[in-house]
């Protein structure tokens, strides 16, 4: 803490500008008035402060607004936002979009701190959903963004957000978090022709129950190994031999690459040797044939 | 051993039809397509076509559609290629490869002469 | 059909050099492609599949990369059994064409 000392003569801060960088910390403190540096924070980042500097100002501000700043002056920060702390940050209530740009583009290029963290979610929270612009701007800024919430998070996301989703988006995240945003990508993306409905929700399939795969199938959709090996592997193994030739089309010819990795070994496994032999690759491991297949769970469902 | 036989040579008159064979051993011959490819002397390798032998699906370079056939007998695990109307630019190596091009038959040397 | 083409058309390096012969396709084909060595009056010989798996029993010094539609093979400190011919072939659906081939010859 700084100890509050008189300002010298002639030295009172009239507005914020360079002459300050002179200042030693005892004088900032006594010479800067907190209400002038609110209302000239935008000013601030075009001043190269020390960090000593800058611990001074976001000083002041604090004193000034204790219970947190107003959004007027969060816009504003730059990089004095990279002073504060979550607990400062929690204080916050920001609404604005190009409040929280303003923020993001100081972090811009480094990992999500847990400053930046708090900020997104104090900004989400206050929307009360992830809206298509605020995804937008995240997965702008954070492409893993969306990978890092959890499935209860991501239950929030309204389905018309997931046009603001990229393929690269989606590259960190698990199957069950595709579990929850398949369906909305599937309500989405609805009313697209086949072609382009592939297109859209191809990212999302890893949270495709079997069903959907096998009317994929129907549409001569070339699906590629790179997708195919994200599927969940239980919507796989039901899908027969004709239905994942068709499924994969010319990349068929991938799954011999891939006979020893989840989910083409367990699938080679389900099926009749016969039935693989059709595809021509060389696959092995099927059911010899001549042998019965008892569908156990089914048993178990009966009983 | 795995292999594929093909006979080292044959000699055809102009505007004859000859059956090439090639026969597979040591694996599934069910498992793969069989592939043909043809080289002329001092060439390059020009792919023909290729037949599943479990499905008999059979796809074809176009350029060789009206006059190539393909063939297996699974008995025996043999594919043929079957060449009608032969000319001279029919003089060249034929291959049969299997799918996974590990395997190549030693090659049959056409030549068409009168 | 894919045109699949191969440059340079012939090539002559020494013993211990490095070289690369690449492969072109005309529209995408992911990472089916396939390279071959052969030598005359032989049959080819399969040195890489999916672009860049190495075959069975061929030496490390060859390696293969690519996708999409650019592709290429290098070969590391020549040997004298690496003179021959080299072909790519796409894997991707069919008609499978071949490149025109690269001649490598000893300097």
């Known amino acids: 803490e700084v100890e509050k000392t008189a300002c010298p003569s002639g030295k009172k801060a009239r507005e914020i500008d360079e002459s300050l960088i002179f200042y030693k910390k005892w004088e900032l403190e006594a010479c800067v008035d907190a209400a002038l540096l609110a209302t000239q924070m935008d000013r601030v980042n075009a001043i190269p402060f020390t960090y000593e500097q800058l611990d001074v100002l976001k000083h002041k501000l604090d004193e000034l607004y204790p219970q947190g700043y107003p959004e007027s002056v969060i816009q504003h920060l730059g990089y004095l936002f990279l002073k504060m702390s979550p607990e400062d940050i929690r204080k916050w209530n920001v609404t604005s979009l190009e409040t929280l740009k303003a923020l993001l583009e100081v972090n811009k290029g480094h990992e999500m701190s847990p400053q930046v963290a708090t900020l997104i979610d104090r900004f989400v929270k206050g929307r009360g959903q992830l809206d298509k612009d605020t995804l937008d701007t995240l997965t702008a800024f954070y492409p893993g963004y969306l990978c890092s919430l959890s499935p209860e998070e991501l239950s929030s996301v309204p389905p018309s957000s997931i046009w603001a989703v990229r393929p690269q988006d989606l590259d960190t995240c698990d199957p069950r978090q595709l579990d929850v945003l398949y369906p909305k990508a599937r309500l989405a993306f609805q009313n697209m022709n086949g072609s382009e409905y592939f297109v859209k929700i191809q990212s999302f399939l890893g949270g495709a129950p079997t069903e959907d795969l096998k009317a994929l199938s129907q549409q001569n959709v070339s699906m590629d190994l790179a997708t195919f090996m994200k599927l969940r592997t239980d919507a796989v193994l039901p899908l027969t031999v004709a239905e994942v030739q068709k499924l994969l089309g010319p990349h068929v010819e991938g799954l011999k690459a891939e006979e020893r990795h989840r989910p083409v070994r367990d699938w080679i496994l389900r099926q009749r040797q016969d039935d693989l032999d059709t595809l021509g690759l060389g696959l092995q491991g099927g059911i010899p044939n001549g042998y019965l297949v008892l569908d156990l769970s089914m048993q178990e469902a009966l009983s | 051993q795995v292999q594929l036989q093909q006979p080292g040579t044959e000699l055809v008159k102009p505007g004859a039809s000859v059956r090439l064979s090639c026969r597979a051993s040591g694996y599934s011959f069910s498992s793969y397509w069989m592939h043909w490819v043809k080289q002329r002397p001092g060439q390059g390798l020009e792919w023909l076509g290729n037949i599943n032998p479990t499905t008999g699906d059979i796809n074809y370079n176009e350029k060789f559609r009206n006059r190539a056939t393909l063939a297996v007998d699974k008995s025996s695990t043999t594919a043929y290629l079957q060449l009608t109307s032969l000319t001279s630019e029919d003089s060249a190596v034929y291959f049969c490869v299997r799918h996974d091009g590990f395997l190549w038959g030693q090659g049959t040397t056409l030549t068409v002469s009168s | 059909d894919i045109q699949m083409t191969q440059s340079p058309a012939s090539l002559s390096a020494s013993v211990g050099e490095t070289v690369t012969i690449t492969c072109r396709a005309s529209?995408?084909?992911?990472?089916?492609l396939a390279w071959y060595q052969q030598k005359q009056g032989k049959s080819p010989q399969l040195l890489v599949y999916y672009a860049k798996t190495l075959a069975e029993g061929v030496s490390s010094r060859f390696s293969g990369s690519g996708s999409g539609t650019q592709f290429s093979l290098k070969i590391n400190s020549l040997q004298p059994e690496d003179f021959g011919t080299y072909y790519c072939q796409h894997q991707f659906g069919t008609p499978r064409t071949f490149g025109g081939g690269t001649k490598l010859e000893i300097r």
């Open positions: 529209e995408n084909i992911y990472s089916y």
